[in-house]
């Protein structure tokens, strides 16, 4: 298991094999390349992202079936906004500013997605969440 | 109440060139995106465009990409469409349309204006 | 593109029934999808959106259902009003599409 569930928003980690301790900072944890935090306090979509900001990464975007199965373990029972939106009329981006190729479903009908261990949907973006923050190593 | 005022229309030739306008009022125009759909003439209807709240995002159909450029100056509370090169298929009813706040869904439209190509 | 295709073209009721209007499409549109309705001379009205939500105003009779590909709209008990066309939009994938429109007329 990569990690472990202790309560809502509370993790446990364990490094994943293919981590580099020094590639990331305290409290961030890499894997395939890339540093992931995963946050303990709620927020909106917007305010996540700046959050993610602050730290010169974002909200997570996801490259592969990999990624997306390391982030469901992590995320557990609890929603966690991820980076990706849907603007009225514009495809889906990631908050990279990349566009989404739909090589994954997202169910419901919003425009703000976060995952959890068992779906990746959508929800109001101002709704407060957990979330996950993402950037390359360095 | 939410009002949406089309404007503009007109029969213009092939080639031609014509400027919409959307004159909302009864909300406060500059928080929400807008977007133009049009109808021809006893036909389904076809989306056009959208633009952003603060107008630095914009997004069209391929069939007026390159030919149509939307726009909205949030001092005057009015949204335009910008037709050049117009073409015969591009005669048709044009709605401007307010999407829901915080929302993907186009929940107001106006009376529509009617576009004309012909020669 | 999406297509959306939508049946009966028209569909032949009176007063009292019930009318059902399916909304296929050509891919998943998870639940981005929307319901209008059109009567002549007048612009579209937002009638449901996210495949089930009655949009402001609506009367409870009507309805909507479905996921992915499949979609439902559903006029309990058909008032005179209620005798127009209806286009399913989608939001799922850019450019949003419309259906060709179901017309439900007075049989």
């Known amino acids: 298991s990569v990690g472990q569930y202790n309560c809502p928003g509370q993790y446990t980690f364990s490094m994943p094999s293919d981590s580099h301790v020094s590639s990331c900072s305290e409290d961030w944890v890499g894997y395939q390349r890339k540093c992931y935090f995963i946050s303990t306090v709620k927020r909106s979509w917007t305010s996540a992202q700046n959050a993610c900001s602050e730290h010169g990464a974002t909200l997570a975007v996801i490259d592969s079936e990999k990624d997306m199965n390391f982030l469901k373990r992590y995320a557990g029972r609890e929603e966690h906004w991820v980076g990706l939106k849907k603007e009225p009329g514009h495809p889906w981006k990631w908050s990279n500013g990349k566009e989404f190729n739909n090589w994954f479903n997202v169910t419901g009908s919003d425009k703000c997605v976060f995952l959890k261990n068992t779906e990746v949907s959508s929800m109001e973006c101002e709704k407060n969440l957990y979330w996950i923050c993402n950037k390359p190593y360095k | 109440q939410v009002q949406l005022v089309e404007s503009g229309g007109g029969l213009v030739q092939p080639g031609g060139s014509l400027r919409l306008s959307c004159a909302a009022s009864?909300?406060?125009?500059?928080?929400?995106?807008m977007s133009w759909v049009r109808q021809a003439p006893g036909k389904g209807l076809e989306w056009v465009s959208v633009?952003?709240?603060?107008?630095?995002?914009?997004h069209y159909a391929d069939s007026v990409k390159g030919r149509f450029t939307i726009s909205r100056d949030n001092s005057k509370n009015t949204l335009y469409l910008q037709m050049n090169s117009l073409r015969a298929e591009d005669t048709a009813v044009y709605y401007c349309a307010r999407y829901i706040g915080n929302s993907l869904y186009m929940d107001f439209w106006g009376q529509g204006t009617l576009v004309t190509v012909s020669s | 593109d999406i297509v959306l295709t939508q049946s009966p073209a028209t569909l032949s009721l009176s007063p009292g029934e019930r009318a059902t209007l399916s909304c296929r499409a050509s891919q998943s549109v998870s639940s981005y999808l929307a319901w209008y309705q059109q009567k002549p001379g007048q612009a579209p009205r937002l009638l449901i959106y996210g495949t089930s939500i009655r949009a402001t105003g609506v009367p409870a009779r009507f309805s909507g259902s479905g996921s992915g590909t499949d979609f439902t709209l559903t006029i309990s008990s058909l008032e005179p009003e209620d005798f127009a066309t209806y286009y399913c939009q989608q939001e799922y994938s850019s450019p949003p599409t419309f259906g060709q429109g179901t017309k439900v007329e007075i049989k």
């Open positions: 009864g909300f406060t125009f500059s928080n929400y995106y």
């Open positions: 633009i952003s709240y603060d107008g630095i995002s914009t």
